[in-house]
Interface confidence: low
């Protein structure tokens, strides 16, 4: 997946719903990444993706402090960034984008959520003149119903992603339970 022609094209944003009446305060807190799909994501059956968690903290200016906690190389890895509110509630851009070399645009759109159990979030970025997109299935717990997973698969497919670009990270205990 390292040349432009290899990447599945990002879908038009008209095919990506936006959660109606998005409640930024209710979206706060920890979300486990139960599902992950994207044009730069490939399922590796021999080395499956480990689950990670992302914490959303609302700041006074209504942007989010976003921290992802990953278990990598036998230690906890923290990835921190800021999501700044975009054109409409539930849509965000990346704060301080100029500090990320090669990154020219970054969009986050909350597709759907019920806040206390599950969410689907769409991400699109242009980096080194290549357009990447991904969808995350978030859960407040590490397990979600098969119906929600099937819905996630269907949505990912509707954006042009085949099965091998859709993964369900393996639940772990390290780092993400704190």
């Amino acid at each position: 997946q390292d040349s432009t022609s290899d990447l599945i094209p990002a879908p038009p944003l008209s095919k990506v719903p936006l959660q109606q009446n998005f409640q930024d305060n209710q979206f706060q807190g920890k979300w486990y990444v139960v599902g992950l799909a994207g044009n730069a994501i490939l399922r590796e059956d021999k080395d499956p993706q480990k689950m990670y968690a992302t914490i959303y903290e609302l700041k006074e200016d209504k942007s989010y402090n976003v921290t992802s906690v990953l278990f990598r190389k036998k230690k906890c890895d923290y990835w921190i960034r800021t999501f700044v509110p975009g054109c409409q509630p539930g849509e965000f851009t990346l704060g301080n984008i100029k500090s990320y070399p090669g990154l020219t645009s970054y969009l986050v759109r909350v597709v759907s959520t019920n806040y206390n159990q599950h969410a689907m979030v769409f991400f699109k970025k242009v980096s080194q003149n290549r357009e990447y997109f991904k969808i995350t299935l978030y859960g407040r717990t590490k397990e979600l119903t098969s119906e929600l997973k099937e819905n996630f698969i269907r949505f990912s497919k509707s954006l042009g992603l085949p099965e091998n670009h859709i993964v369900f990270p393996v639940p772990i205990d390290q780092c993400i339970d704190g």
């Epitope: 038009p12 944003l13 008209s14 095919k15 719903p17 936006l18 959660q19 109606q20 409409q88 597709v111 759907s112 819905n151 269907r154 949505f155 497919k157 509707s158 042009g160 085949p162």
Partner: antibody, heavy 118, light 106 residues
């Protein structure tokens, strides 16, 4: 019944008409795409366009860009199709059809017959 | 736009006979979906994601294919299967349908 469409319409050439489609699934309506599709007698289907009610974003088939206007009301969970400058060529059955996250339709309305005649 | 060509346009089959109809796309698509329409009624989702049967569809129906070539098969024709079947794609806008295959009972 998931999608309930308005009744048959008879219109004169040059006039306009507004068709409606009510979705009884209020949870799904705002985040589902509502498409409009027309079927002429003895013919296949033509996709007119779709709307995402939560943000009012629309897509139109090229043929219908100047003919159709899509709208939606998330309070009444109703989608609308406006057709202008009607001619006899616009006589057809018009269906609303819903697509959730998928690229197919899970439900169709019962259809509205539009007859354009002088 | 992606053009879907269905064949045959009209066909008839005796009860118990195996039926196959095809849908050919002008360029590659990820999935094809099929709808059944009977005279005077609105279409019903019949087969989606190429091969998955919609709720209530008899197991004698199946769908298959990939790329530009897809098909719908009925393993053993029954009178209630007489209808027009349409294929559909939405890989790109505009969404397009095939012209339909009308299946009659002999």
């Amino acid at each position: 019944v998931h999608l309930q469409q308005s009744g048959s319409e008879l219109r004169s050439p040059g006039s306009s008409v507004k068709l409606s489609c009510k979705d009884f699934d209020s949870e799904v309506f705002p985040i589902a795409y509502m498409s409009w599709v027309r079927q002429k007698p003895g013919h296949g289907f033509e996709w007119i366009g779709d709307i995402l009610p939560s943000i009012g974003r629309t897509n139109y088939g090229e043929k219908f860009e100047d003919k159709a206007t899509l709208d939606a009301d998330t309070v009444s969970n109703t989608a609308y199709l406006d057709l202008n400058s009607l001619t006899s060529e616009d006589s057809a059955i018009y269906y609303c059809a819903r697509s959730r996250f998928e690229d197919y339709f899970d439900y169709w309305g019962q259809g509205t017959t539009l007859t354009v005649s002088s | 736009q992606i053009v879907l060509t269905q064949s045959p346009a009209i066909m008839s089959a005796s009860p118990g006979e195996k039926v196959t109809m095809t849908c050919s796309a002008s360029s590659s698509v990820s999935y094809i979906h099929w709808y059944q329409q009977k005279s005077g009624t609105s279409p019903k989702r019949w087969i989606f994601d190429t091969s998955k049967l919609a709720s209530g569809v008899p197991a004698r129906f199946s769908g298959s294919g990939s790329g530009t070539s897809y098909s719908l098969t009925i393993s053993s024709m029954e009178a209630e299967d007489a209808a027009t079947y349409y294929c559909q794609q939405w890989r790109t806008n505009p969404l397009t349908f095939g012209a339909g295959t009308k299946l009659e009972i002999k």
